[in-house]
């Protein structure tokens, strides 16, 4: 099935979803190692079988990742390689998703209740907005289909809503600074302690200085994952989640907290 989709000159949104599921064997939300090599192999074979040349995007992609064991791509990168239907592709190409900071601001706009989740209805509005910004309108049926597909693509814990880290897979891997924090997330108890101790003035939120101090310490402790030279970027991206410079517990938890225990 994936092979026949790869032979198409235009891949629909739902076909794209099936291709992704087929290759992302471990459900990690990324294609790396063997998964990525399988994709490249099958892509080349499918195009050959159909008597089709590799498109320039495909050629670049194969050149870039064909000989590498350490390659890693997300849904965004794949959407740029495959001849996906235009409106669906636009969701991955919009300005809001060009930088992590813009993405965080967009998230803040839609997670209005600071719950840390975007539910189906909010997601639909989010996608509608993205398309409108690209001067595209789609009918409600198509929008519902895209929303459903996005949920299927990104909702890795199947709870019917998207967390920030799930939604962030809309970002290109290189831009997704949240990946850097995956390995250093704290348990709920540790996170609450850190929040309390770095909130120097006890006003219940973290300001930019307090965040700066916290990030510097995290960089110091986690040199493998975080680079102290990128502190300005980390800070800018995280502060984009804030409300007028106030980073509340639930907001910072999206980045630094792994769970309850």
């Amino acid at each position: 099935m994936a092979e026949s989709h790869l032979q198409s000159s235009l891949i629909t949104a739902s076909q794209f979803f099936e291709i992704w599921l087929h290759f992302d064997a471990d459900g990690s939300g990324y294609l790396e190692g063997k998964e990525l090599q399988n994709l490249i192999q099958e892509l080349q074979q499918a195009r050959k079988k159909a008597g089709l040349e590799l498109s320039p995007e495909m050629k670049t992609f194969v050149d870039q990742y064909g000989q590498r064991d350490d390659g890693k791509i997300g849904i965004v990168e794949l959407a740029h390689v495959l001849p996906t239907e235009e409106n669906f592709l636009l969701l991955f190409r919009c300005q809001q998703l060009k930088s992590c900071e813009e993405f965080m601001k967009t998230w803040r706009k839609y997670d209005t209740d600071h719950s840390g989740f975007i539910e189906t209805e909010e997601l639909k509005n989010f996608l509608k907005d993205l398309l409108e910004k690209a001067n595209k309108t789609v009918d409600d049926t198509k929008l519902a289909e895209y929303t459903d597909l996005m949920l299927k693509l990104f909702d890795s814990n199947n709870d019917g809503k998207l967390e920030l880290t799930e939604m962030a897979r809309l970002l290109p891997v290189q831009e997704n600074f949240l990946l850097k924090f995956q390995g250093i997330k704290m348990c709920g108890k540790e996170f609450n302690k850190a929040f309390e101790l770095y909130d120097q003035d006890g006003n219940g939120y973290i300001d930019e200085n307090e965040l700066d101090a916290l990030l510097k310490d995290l960089c110091e402790k986690n040199k493998q994952d975080l680079d102290i030279n990128n502190i300005t970027t980390y800070k800018k991206n995280i502060m984009a989640l804030s409300d007028g410079g106030k980073l509340y517990r639930t907001d910072l938890a999206l980045i630094l907290c792994a769970g309850d225990n």
Partner: antibody
Framework: QGQMQQSGAELVKPGASVKLSCKTS????????ISWLKQKPGQSLEWIAW????????NYNQKFTGKAQLTVDTSSSTAYMQFSSLTAEDSAIYYC??????????WGQGTTLTVSS | DIVLTQSPASLPVSLGQRATISCRAS??????????MHWYQHKPGQPPKLLIY???NLESGVPARFSGSGSGTDFTLNIHPVEEEDAATYYC?????????FGGGTKLEIK
């Protein structure tokens, strides 16, 4: 182990200004807050203000707003407090202290300021 | 501002006995499971020294005969057994909100 070395005793005239220094070592200056505190003879301690060394941002006890001005020089890991329009009331020992979290873990030895004509 | 009232102002204790110093805040200094009360020891000619932070945590290098307890508005510093070198003035301090304030101090004298 962190250390904080304060400048020597000062004898100044009323109305003048004075700049006290606090040179730090043994900890990451740029992710620390430096607080300044006042102690008059036979009295308790008073918190004046803090400065976040990473950005130079400050937070003052309202009582000392306009009287104290805090600055840092990150290249030398030194914090400063300028005290202006001095009166006899300002005669006291002034301490700098570091806080990374919400308690003062390293202290300077104190600088005695005497305001007298 | 939160006012901290320490008692007693002066405390004469015999060597080996227990010294108990109390600190009462004009409003709660506890939030989210943490109590922002700390204790310092101050000897003449020296800077204050952190003994206990967050109500009950012993600062590294401080002897285990010092202990702190309490939450909300009422806090206690205990020293047992008291030793000669413990003669000093002890201050409580809160960092619950700005401005941070200190108690009036308790002077511990060895009898």
């Amino acid at each position: 182990q962190g250390q904080m070395q304060q400048s020597g005793a000062e004898l100044v005239k009323p109305g003048a200004s004075v700049k006290l220094s606090c040179k730090t070592s043994g900890f990451t200056f740029s992710s620390s807050y430096i607080s300044w505190l006042k102690q008059k003879p036979g009295q308790s301690l008073e918190w004046i203000a803090w400065i976040y060394a990473g950005t130079g941002d400050t937070n003052y006890n309202q009582k000392f707003t306009g009287k104290a001005q805090l600055t840092v020089d990150t290249s030398s890991s030194t914090a400063y407090m300028q005290f202006s329009s001095l009166t006899a009331e300002d005669s006291a020992i002034y301490y700098c202290a570091r806080h990374k979290y919400r308690y003062l873990d390293y202290w300077g030895q104190g600088t005695t300021l005497t305001v007298s004509s | 501002d939160i006012v901290l009232t320490q008692s007693p102002a002066s405390l004469p204790v015999s060597l080996g006995q227990r010294a108990t110093i109390s600190c009462r805040a004009s409003k709660s200094v506890s939030t989210s499971g943490y109590s922002y009360m700390h204790w310092y020891q101050h000897k003449p000619g020296q800077p204050p020294k952190l003994l206990i932070y967050l109500a009950s945590n012993l600062e590294s290098g401080v002897p285990a005969r010092f202990s702190g307890s309490g939450s909300g508005t009422d806090f206690t510093l205990n020293i047992h057994p008291v030793e000669e070198e413990d003669a000093a003035t002890y201050y409580c301090q809160h960092t619950r909100e700005l401005p941070w304030t200190f108690g009036g101090g308790t002077k511990l004298e060895i009898k």
